[in-house]
């Protein structure tokens, strides 16, 4: 049994990191490995990781973690047994993805305006929630090559659009991911979509 | 929200033994080490024990060492301190703490052991 | 073992003056991947002691931005921006490079 694929592991900088890797071949991920990590700091202790299978050959192990700072390293040892596949180490600050935004909800009531509005993932005493910024996409159910992308750079985790920028009449969805530019994370995955009609009031035309 | 409460102290002759326990809540237990921490009246902290998570490793300040045990029942989310040969320089509160990062995150009220004939 | 040497042993101080209180350390708490093995503590009168400031210089939960942590090596100070009131207590640092965790003697911080 050999690792094909070493471990990569990203941090959601809260209380979990997930490592996925690949193996030589077809592996029961939870029956016969085992991923430990342990903090670097004096009297820590290591904890056990029950790997899941993610495809064949692919295992995906949820490190729990506490609230994460900069100076958090683990060391990661990965065993079949009593025997030691692979040993590395992981500094969750430096491979950041960010938790998918929640709650995304369109009010349509505000005159001719679309209000998309959704949740920070985080808590207000975690250091990311001051520190996302979001892509918001919105497509039409009907036209596939009516596809874009809002980025909102600011911290409010909203967007207002102009309803008559999109086509009257038709369904549309939206979905929303996140950010933090501060530890250069990865974006988030989309959030849930939601869906909604749009119509609104097309305005005279002047001849 | 985290809480460690100390319990067991009190009036006790030199030679004698006490055991003090710290019940902890509001945080997986078997997932930190833990340590005691004692407070002579008027004087400054002075570090006793610690234990891992597991239990499996304990940690002593060479003072203590053969005089003072510690041990932990994670199923009762519990820490101990076994305090035997008791001095009049063992008089002191007893504070629990919650270890994360080698420092301590959490602290306990403290148990007050008096030696005294 | 290490030495934990703080000072001044009482500091009075004016509400709403910065204070700093020093502690060195017999040998360097510095490790491996940059970070300082020092932290700091507060311990009001009748209560027991809370953290302020872990490895060296970052403040812990909970903890007004008033105090700072800073240092390397053998040489760290806490710094209170602005002293209030409720600050009064004693401060210790304690190092986390190896057991025995060692504390410094304490320095009392009381109002003028």
């Known amino acids: 049994m050999k690792v094909l694929q070493e471990p990569t592991c990203v941090s959601d900088y809260m209380s979990i990191s997930t490592c996925e890797w690949k193996m030589n071949g077809p592996t029961n991920c939870s029956t016969e490995l085992r991923l430990l990590y342990q903090l670097v700091f004096l009297l820590s202790e290591a904890h056990t990781c029950i790997p899941e299978n993610n495809g064949g050959a692919g295992c995906v192990c949820h490190l729990l973690m506490d609230d994460v700072v900069s100076a958090d390293n683990y060391t990661l040892d990965l065993w079949a047994g009593q025997q030691l596949l692979w040993k590395g180490s992981f500094k969750p600050s430096e491979h950041v993805k960010p938790r998918a935004p929640g709650n995304l909800t369109v009010h349509t009531n505000v005159s001719d305006t679309l209000l998309l509005t959704w949740s920070n993932p985080y808590p207000p005493d975690n250091y990311l929630y001051n520190h996302l910024t979001y892509a918001v996409n919105i497509w039409s159910e009907n036209d596939p090559a009516d596809f874009r992308i809002y980025n909102v750079t600011y911290l409010e985790p909203s967007l207002r659009i102009a309803a008559s920028t999109l086509k009257s009449g038709i369904s549309y969805r939206a979905r929303v991911r996140a950010w933090a530019q501060c530890y250069n994370t990865t974006w988030s995955e989309w959030s849930p979509s939601t869906k909604w009609h749009n119509s609104y009031r097309e305005p005279f035309e002047q001849h | 929200e985290v809480q460690l409460v100390e319990s067991g102290g009190g009036l006790v002759q030199p030679g004698g033994s006490l055991r003090l326990s710290c019940a902890a809540s509001g945080f997986t237990f078997s997932r930190y080490a833990v340590s005691w921490v004692r407070q002579a009246p008027g004087k400054g902290l002075e570090w006793v024990s610690a234990i891992g998570g597991s239990g499996g490793k304990t940690y002593y300040a060479d003072s203590f060492k053969g005089r003072f045990t510690i041990s932990r029942d994670n199923s009762k989310n519990t820490l101990y301190l076994q305090l035997n040969s008791l001095r009049a320089e063992d008089t002191a509160v007893y504070y629990c703490a919650r270890v994360l990062r080698g420092g301590f995150w959490d602290w306990g009220q403290g148990t007050l052991v008096t030696v005294s004939s | 073992d290490i030495v934990m040497t703080q000072s001044p042993l009482s500091l009075p101080v004016t509400p709403g003056e910065p204070a700093s209180i020093s502690c060195k350390s017999s040998?360097?708490?510095?490790?491996?991947?940059?970070?300082?093995?020092l932290d700091w503590y507060l311990q009001k009168p009748g209560q027991s002691p809370q953290l302020l400031i872990y490895?060296?210089?970052f403040t812990a939960k909970g903890v007004p931005d008033r105090f700072s942590g800073s240092g390397s090596g053998t040489d760290f100070t806490l710094k209170i921006s602005r002293v209030e009131a409720e600050d009064v207590g004693i401060y210790y640092c304690m190092q986390t490079l190896q057991t025995p965790l060692t504390f410094g003697g304490g320095t009392k911080v009381e109002i003028k």
């Open positions: 490895l060296g210089s």
């Open positions: 040998q360097s708490l510095l490790e491996g991947q940059g970070y300082n093995r």
